[in-house]
């Protein structure tokens, strides 16, 4: 009955500080409303990075000021986190909640370790 959530173990952000990964869940029920939350775990502290609720079959929409974007297809969510810097390197956990109809289910992935390397500044040219 528990909901299983799968996500990649490691992802490397690109030079523009953007990281993408897939969050896939095995749904025990027929949900029509799903909430996806990205959490960051650092030093046993957990903080919310972004969250979106969507109706199955529709696109998920994050708030305008969110650093996340994403698309959904069936039980799979493609997540992109932008504006990352080296200090943001850490474990990013995908949490999926089947909000409606009852019963409610929650699933938490094992986390994706995102590595972010700040680009070297361009050398001054004379």
């Amino acid at each position: 009955k528990a909901m299983h959530v799968a996500q990649p173990a490691v992802v490397l952000a690109n030079s523009r500080g953007t990281a993408s990964f897939v969050c896939e869940y095995a749904s025990p029920g027929k949900a029509t409303e799903v909430r996806v939350t990205v959490l960051r775990q650092a030093d046993s502290q957990v903080t919310e990075v972004c969250a979106a609720t969507y109706m199955m079959g529709n696109e998920l929409t994050f708030l305008d000021d969110s650093i996340c974007t994403g698309t959904s297809s069936g039980n799979q969510v493609n997540l992109t986190i932008q504006g990352l810097r080296a200090m943001d390197t850490g474990l990013y956990i995908c949490k999926v909640e089947l909000m409606y109809p009852p019963p409610y289910y929650m699933g938490i992935g094992n986390g994706t370790q995102i590595y972010v390397i700040d680009p070297e500044p361009c050398p001054d040219s004379d």
Epitope: K1, A2, M3, H4, P28, E33, T37, L39, V46, T47, E48, A51, K95, M99, Y100, P102, P103, Y104, Y105, M106, G107, I108
Partner: antibody, heavy 118, light 108 residues
Framework: QVQLVESGGGVVQPGRSLRLSCAAS????????MHWVRQAPGKGLEWVAV????????YYADSVKGRFTFSRDNSKNTLYLQMNSLRAEDTAVYYC???????????WGQGTLVTVSS | EIVLTQSPGTLSLSPGERATLSCRAS???????LAWYQQKPGQAPRLLIY???SRATGIPDRFSGSGSGTDFTLTISRLEPEDFAVYYC?????????FGQGTKVEIK
């Protein structure tokens, strides 16, 4: 720091109504699902109801379904539990609790006692 | 509904001893969704462990959780005077959210 403060408890006759409140502070209230949990005197914990972060959905325990209504006002950082058709078995301390980011109930209020007696 | 059964009902131990509390689920519960709470008389419950084995903020390392499937354990390695209380397990992976009936850890 996170604080949850319940109020509104008291003694009420069977069949009557009561409304509990829970004032929240110290966190972004509108980002969290919130719960009511009750504890009858000398007994264990019983989950009562949940309301999602935006108030869109609510689930209730079978024992209170159709009699209790859970609502929230995110502009006031406050939860409400409207309890109608109260029964003697509803006598308990009622706690509001925050559904933490990882799912467990990470912060609890101090509780408010509801006694249903004639 | 997932029913959680805790044992023993009461555990009589002395300070400094090790306490082992059991929680058994009526059906499989992912370890990600099992929590333990401590409650002292006249106080609200306090979250100790979430995800079966992760300590909540500020919880001393003498408290540890383990288990998977249907069998979970809370261990207190060396009982301190302030640890004598009632302990509840809870599953929060699906509705309705359910608690065990509690284990009372009392001074022998």
């Amino acid at each position: 720091q996170v604080q949850l403060v319940e109020s509104g408890g008291g003694v009420v006759q069977p069949g009557r109504s009561l409304r509990l409140s829970c004032a929240a502070s110290g966190f972004t209230f509108s980002s969290y699902g919130m719960h009511w949990v009750r504890q009858a005197p000398g007994k264990g914990l019983e989950w009562v109801a949940v309301i999602w972060y935006d108030g869109s959905n609510k689930y209730y325990a079978d024992s209170v379904k159709g009699r209790f209504t859970f609502s929230r006002d995110n502009s006031k950082n406050t939860l409400y539990l409207q309890m109608n058709s109260l029964r003697a078995e509803d006598t308990a301390v009622y706690y509001c609790a925050r559904g933490g980011l990882m799912g467990a109930f990470d912060y609890w209020g101090q509780g408010t006692l509801v006694t249903v007696s004639s | 509904e997932i029913v959680l059964t805790q044992s023993p009902g009461t555990l009589s131990l002395s300070p400094g001893e090790r306490a082992t509390l059991s929680c058994r689920a009526s059906q499989s519960v992912s370890s990600s969704y099992l929590a333990w709470y401590q409650q002292k008389p006249g106080q609200a419950p306090r979250l100790l462990i979430y995800g079966a084995s992760s300590r909540a903020t500020g919880i001393p390392d003498r408290f540890s959780g383990s288990g998977s499937g249907t069998d979970f354990t809370l261990t207190i390695s060396r009982l301190e005077p302030e640890d004598f209380a009632v302990y509840y397990c809870q599953q929060y992976g699906t509705s309705p959210w359910t608690f065990g009936q509690g284990t009372k850890v009392e001074i022998k």
